[in-house]
């Protein structure tokens, strides 16, 4: 009789875990910024501290009647989803509630900021174990709310936020759009995006993953033993906050970057029907449903990577897009994508001591995306080698010339606007191991890394006939670090990574006029980390 | 995720001199004013004044006080509702939108954001 949502996110081998661990043994603390809550509810009694924090706007309307059970409804349900005795994800976790939403579920950016500051002060006054902050709220894009989240995240706090229920791009809302926050969209029992009336879950590149958020049974504030179903991205975020709490209670030293990477890596993949999302958002939205990952002891030193999309560059001629990894992550490769195919490629550059992935729009293009592959590579030392464009008719080759450095990604950037020069040479010279082979008139950038036991290899797949996309996957045990379209057909839209799959996209019109000799090639660089081995390039 | 989304950023037209008052030497305002793109969610009259990252504790208080003093000279009463020290330097202020130009010219100010609603999801 386990509720569907818990069954979905907690694999069978974890389901008896609670009963083996002493109650309340976890030192993890979850802070919930929401409505007031009913602390005496059976689900959460004894695990919840209702702080004296209260920063809410007045309720609207002169005839508004404050009814305690209604005022507490949203927060009580979420507290139950996180740590409820019976329907909670992290049953032993202690929770602190801060009231930032009024009885109508409305709050302010300023009230939320003061709440976040309250948490920071508590942290300074009495340092404790790992902290998770659940933000089951959303407002319009706010630079300061995002900045506050960034500052708090940099103190080691893990923030989890609702993507929003506006059936819209999550990047238009805060705190959902803050990169340092784990942003969660909502799915139903069929693993499909949640519809809420005429609206539904938000989507897009600012969503990290999805979690159950429809008809979630949890504590009802109507009475101390009442239960009810609620739906929304708040419920989804509460599931992920619970998962994070469980991960941290097992391994308190996990960092935000490790937590996010593990959540992504161990999530259920490709079950969401992407057709629900607007067409232009489908490629940007992660097809991931959260599940509780195994501990790092059980999974060894896997190489973990995720794909980070930039904002759209906009259509101006010199528009650039920038994708960034989290501070702890290594940028192992950079690619670009444009729906019109008019792009001048991508490159990696250092900005303020951090490597960033850049993409450049071309004249007449509708804009580009930069696509960064961000990885956790312990003790990595990475650098970029680039070669200016070669003379017409020649290819450019770049390889990793430092000892024990392996190639993890290639980028190509054209100095010229004329797309027609990017023709594949009649004969492509045989690729040397660990080399980036450039298109004509392209500057080539090689991402080279040294890390204990890091080994990489290239995998190519070419299609000569008509095809909208070419894909190549890294096999089990290997992780995709780089993905490119190799000097190929007349017009490619670009390349990007979806989990362990490298996708090279071709323009529809380019398919018809392609000659059989012009194969579109998707090139994947696949790496793995074997701590005992030396860094090497595998042929 | 860090680019500004559908977000209003306004550079207010500012006079180079503040009513010619001697102690208020011209300060070129590089600070911007930001507000929610959804009009119904805006809370005009309440503003979060965000100061430069390295602003010291005392400077935060001085900036808030300076704003109060300069507003008073113009016949406006403003209320500092909260001072942010621990997460970022800044303060929350209740004031007329007429004073935004003045506030943006204060030293240490990086940007000012109009308060707005957030909602349970």
């Amino acid at each position: 009789s386990i509720p569907w949502n818990l069954e979905r996110i907690i694999p069978a081998w974890h389901q008896t875990e609670e009963d083996r661990s002493p109650d309340g043994s976890s030192q993890v603390e979850v802070y919930l910024l929401d409505t007031s809550i009913q602390g005496a509810h059976r689900e959460i009694e004894g695990r919840v501290t209702i702080t004296d924090f209260n920063s809410v706007p007045e309720e609207d309307g002169t005839r508004f009647h404050r009814q305690a059970s209604k005022c507490d409804s949203h927060g009580t349900h979420l507290a139950g989803v996180v740590s409820g005795r019976d329907a909670g994800v992290a049953k032993g976790t202690s929770l602190h509630s801060l009231r930032v939403l009024n009885c109508q579920g409305k709050g302010t950016v300023s009230g939320t900021l003061i709440g976040l500051e309250f948490i920071r002060k508590s942290q300074l006054i009495q340092p404790s174990g790992p902290l998770v902050v659940l933000l089951p709220l959303a407002g319009g894009y706010s630079r300061i709310l995002n900045a506050a989240c960034r500052h708090l995240a940099r103190t080691g706090v893990v923030l989890v936020a609702a993507a929003g229920n506006f059936r819209d791009d999550a990047c238009l809302y805060s705190p959902a759009s803050a990169p340092e926050v784990i942003t969660v969209g909502a799915t139903n029992a069929q693993d499909q995006p949640v519809t809420l009336g005429t609206l539904g879950t938000n989507f897009g590149r600012c969503v990290d993953l999805f979690a159950p958020g429809k008809d979630i049974i949890g504590a009802s504030s109507d009475c101390s033993t009442c239960f009810m179903s609620q739906s929304g991205t708040s419920q989804a975020a509460a599931h992920v906050a619970g998962i994070v709490a469980r991960m941290l209670s097992r391994e308190p030293t996990l960092t935000l970057a490790e937590l996010r990477q593990r959540l992504i890596h161990f999530s259920t993949k490709d079950v969401i029907n992407m057709a629900w999302f607007p067409e232009d958002q489908q490629v940007l939205t992660p097809n991931l449903v959260a599940t509780l990952p195994p501990s790092t002891h059980e999974t060894g030193g896997q190489l973990l990577c995720r794909t980070v999309w930039s904002a759209h560059s906009g259509p101006t001629r010199t528009a650039t897009a920038t994708a960034r990894c989290a501070p702890e992550e290594e940028l192992l490769s950079c690619s670009s994508f444009s729906r019109s195919g008019r792009r001048r490629g991508d490159w990696i550059e250092a900005i303020g001591g951090q490597q960033v992935c850049k993409a450049l729009n071309a004249f007449g293009g509708e804009g580009v995306y930069a696509v960064a592959r961000c990885c956790l590579v312990p003790r990595a030392n990475c650098s970029i080698h680039n070669t200016p464009a070669a003379r017409a008719g020649l290819e450019t080759h770049v390889h990793c010339h430092q000892k024990d450095h392996v190639l993890t990604g290639c980028s190509f950037h054209w100095e010229v606007e004329d797309l027609s020069v990017r023709r594949q040479p009649a004969l492509r010279s045989r690729r040397q191991p660990g080399q980036c082979v450039g298109h004509q008139a392209a500057s080539v950038y090689a991402s080279c890394c040294h890390a204990p036991g890091l080994e990489c290899k290239i995998k190519e797949h070419g299609i000569s006939g008509p095809s909208e996309q070419v894909t190549v996957a890294c096999e089990a045990g290997w992780t995709l670090t780089g993905c490119n379209v190799l000097p190929g057909a007349s017009l490619t839209l670009g390349a990007y990574s979806v989990d362990n799959l490298c996708v090279a996209r071709v323009h529809d019109t380019a398919r018809a006029d392609r000659t059989s000799g012009e194969a579109t090639v998707a090139a994947a660089i696949c790496c793995r980390s074997r701590p005992s081995a030396k860094a090497s390039w595998v042929q | 995720q860090d680019e500004d989304g559908d977000y209003e950023e306004l550079m207010l037209a500012l006079p180079s001199q503040e009513d010619g008052l001697a102690d208020e030497a011209a300060h070129v305002a590089t600070a911007t004013f930001r507000r929610c793109s959804k009009e119904a969610w805006r809370l005009p009259g309440t503003y979060i004044v965000v100061l430069m990252e390295e602003t010291q504790r005392l400077q935060i208080e001085q900036t808030a006080h300076r704003l109060q003093t300069r507003a008073a000279r113009r016949g406006y009463v403003i209320k500092v509702l909260h001072i942010f020290y621990d997460l970022f330097p800044g303060f929350l202020v209740k004031m007329s939108s007429d004073l935004l130009g003045l506030a943006l010219k204060l030293p240490h100010v990086e940007y000012i954001e109009e308060d707005s609603f957030v909602f349970a999801q």
Partner: antibody, heavy 118, light 107 residues
Framework: QVQLVQSGAEVKKPGASVKVSCKAS????????MHWVRQAPGQGLEWMGE????????NYNEKFKSRVTMTRDTSTSTVYMELSSLRSEDTAVYYC???????????WGQGTTVTVSS | DIQMTQSPSSLSASVGDRVTITCKAS??????VAWYQQKPGKAPKLLIY???HRYTGVPSRFSGSGSGTDFTFTISSLQPEDIATYYC?????????FGQGTKLEIK
């Protein structure tokens, strides 16, 4: 598996006290409330009170408030119900029952028969 | 205290019959109602929780419905092993109160 094992039958004189125990196993003892419910011969079920084993907090039915005491010993995962000033109408089967918040009283002890007779 | 009025107090039905028992609360109890089965000399067994949710391992012929003040318990096709006394119970507030029970017999 979850088990609640109660102490054996008791025969008491009017005015005396009885202390019934209920030993829990197969789950985290402090995570779930324990209730006491009694049933007089040929009658229905009557709720006496509850204890939260985590902190020891109790909540009694007004009817029994002056005579009942519920305690717990977390080291042995045992709860106790003591009823004082016994009278003949207290003759009943006394059950302990675990409450899972979502699932109500999902596990019950086998019952302890208390007979009050002079 | 919240009163739970159960009806009928006893009923006789044939194997295969559809049996319905009702329970009326003296005030709104949301969906915080459970149904139990008790066989002679045994402890009660949980069948339905939160008004309509079947507990683990309970056969699908048992169902519950209702919210607020009116609740119904149904056995869709009576089996010989279903002979017992059935109780409703409100979990909305303390003191917890039970209905007086419905004794079910086979015709």
């Amino acid at each position: 598996q979850v088990q609640l094992v109660q102490s054996g039958a008791e025969v008491k004189k009017p005015g005396a006290s009885v202390k019934v125990s209920c030993k829990a196993s197969g789950y985290t003892f402090t995570s779930y409330y324990m209730h006491w419910v009694r049933q007089a011969p040929g009658q229905g079920l009557e709720w006496m009170g509850e204890i939260n084993p985590s902190g020891g907090r109790t909540n009694y039915n007004e009817k029994f408030k002056s005579r009942v005491t519920m305690t717990r010993d977390t080291s042995t995962s045992t709860v106790y119900m003591e009823l004082s000033s016994l009278r003949s109408e207290d003759t009943a089967v006394y059950y302990c029952a675990r409450e899972r918040p979502l699932h109500a009283m999902d596990y019950w002890g086998q019952g302890t028969t208390v007979t009050v007779s002079s | 205290d919240i009163q739970m009025t159960q009806s009928p107090s006893s009923l006789s039905a044939s194997v295969g019959d559809r049996v319905t028992i009702t329970c009326k609360a003296s005030q709104d109890v949301h969906t915080a109602v459970a149904w139990y089965q008790q066989k002679p000399g045994k402890a009660p067994k949980l069948l339905i929780y939160s008004a309509s949710h079947r507990y683990t391992g309970v056969p699908s012929r048992f169902s519950g419905s209702g919210s607020g003040t009116d609740f119904t318990f149904t056995i869709s096709s009576l089996q010989p092993e279903d002979i017992a006394t059935y109780y409703c119970q409100q979990r909305y507030s303390t003191p917890r109160t039970f209905g007086q029970g419905t004794k079910l017999e086979i015709k």
